[in-house]
């Protein structure tokens, strides 16, 4: 079956700059600013555009070793990134895949709001665990905060 979910979190970083750093250069930046969460990101197929397959490897001691993600859309005009987790991580016996859309919208205060929509494709009658969703959301927010801290400390980067 399918379970739809969404969450949002604010950022002090303007939308264009956050999209550039967090999304467009996330493969390089995340292992650098959050090595405790992401060891490496490699393109195993494609050049970053739709259809690209990425492998994200997690550090020793993490609950999962890796995930494979398929890039479905990169919208540089509307600051929207759509990707599907197709292997590894929570994908397995109960979960077929997770489709994720990250949209960064401008906030009135000059910062931005990160909107994350998830579509969980479960196998059979498996239910999505609310705790699992909470953990995934917290991980995403943690990565965002790490990128935010880096950008605040490096005001010349990603402008």
């Amino acid at each position: 079956g399918v379970f739809n979910y969404e969450a949002e979190t604010p950022s002090v970083i303007p939308a264009a700059r956050l999209f550039k750093a967090f999304i467009l250069d996330g493969d390089k930046l995340l292992p650098k600013v959050a090595p405790e969460a992401v060891s490496s990101v490699e393109n195993i197929e494609g050049n970053g555009g739709p259809g690209t397959i990425k492998k994200i490897t997690f550090p020793e001691g993490s609950p999962f070793k890796y995930v494979k993600e398929r890039v479905d859309e990169v919208d540089r005009v509307n600051f929207k990134y759509s990707f599907s987790v197709i292997e590894g991580g929570a994908v397995g016996d109960a979960l077929e895949k997770v489709c994720n859309e990250i949209k960064i919208v401008a906030a009135p205060d000059g910062g931005s709001i990160l909107k994350i929509s998830n579509k969980f494709h479960t196998k059979g009658d498996h239910e999505i665990n609310a705790e699992q969703i909470k953990i995934e959301k917290e991980k995403a927010v943690g990565l965002l905060k790490a990128v935010e801290s880096y950008l605040l400390a490096h005001s010349d980067a990603y402008n």
Epitope: V2, N4, E6, H121
Partner: antibody, heavy 122, light 108 residues
């Protein structure tokens, strides 16, 4: 403007098959999931099936699972509902409906076709 | 599956009056993932509200949606002659996507 036009309905005997078509125009078809929703005479709405923007993901209501198959042709901007082993309780107006949100879809329906009537009777 | 129960089944009102339609969910509707549709005889349904309270494109502001826990409400502030129809709620948080049985707003 967005248009969805269903065709293929008619009278069919129980156990037989029918294929419904939905021709779409007025929007970027390949970016949207498409659903089929039906309405038995004098009754409420029942969701039947959905197909994702790329055709990879297909889901069905319990009452049609294993008998109906949804498919799409993005080059022709068409969606199809192949209905096998039809039962009298499948008698309904069948609507195709566009998902209200692009790419992965949110599973609400912002545009509907006018519907096509399927009557299953011996 | 999530069961939606609409009440009342029929709502007899006069033009100019306020209509309050209810939709109760059997379980929590995360993210306010509930839509309202209007259907007139021999016509396809039309989307009025999504996300429990967001009006769809071209929908007059006399239509509004609200929620409180698992209870959702569609309000038509001042009924126009063209508003007499059947109204359905629909959840889109968890498949299968389900509809309420409908509320008919009829002329008193």
């Amino acid at each position: 403007q967005v248009q969805l036009v269903e065709s293929g309905g008619g009278v069919v005997q129980p156990g037989r098959s029918l294929r419904l078509s939905c021709a779409a125009s007025g929007f970027t078809f390949s970016r949207y999931a498409i659903h089929w929703v039906r309405q038995a005479p004098g009754k409420g709405l029942e969701w039947v099936a959905v197909i994702s923007y790329d055709g990879d993901d297909k889901y069905y209501g319990d009452s049609v699972k294993g008998r109906f198959t949804i498919s799409r042709d993005n080059s022709k901007t068409m969606v199809y509902l192949h209905m096998n082993s039809l039962r009298t309780e499948d008698t309904a107006v069948y609507y195709c409906a566009k998902d209200g949100y692009s790419l992965y879809g949110k599973d609400y329906f912002d545009y509907w076709g006018q519907g096509t009537l399927v009557t299953v009777s011996s | 599956e999530i069961v939606l129960t609409q009440s009342p089944g029929t709502l007899p009102l006069s033009p100019g009056e306020r209509a309050t339609l209810s939709c109760r969910a059997s379980q929590s509707i995360t993210n306010s993932y509930l839509a309202w549709y209007q259907q007139k005889p021999d016509q396809a349904p039309r989307l009025l509200i999504y996300g429990a309270s967001s009006r769809a494109t071209g929908i007059p502001d006399r239509f509004s949606g609200s929620e409180s826990g698992t209870d959702f409400t569609l309000t038509i502030s001042r009924l126009e002659p063209e508003d007499f129809a059947v109204y359905y709620c629909q959840q889109y948080v968890r498949s299968p996507w389900t509809f309420g049985q409908g509320t008919k707003v009829e002329i008193k």
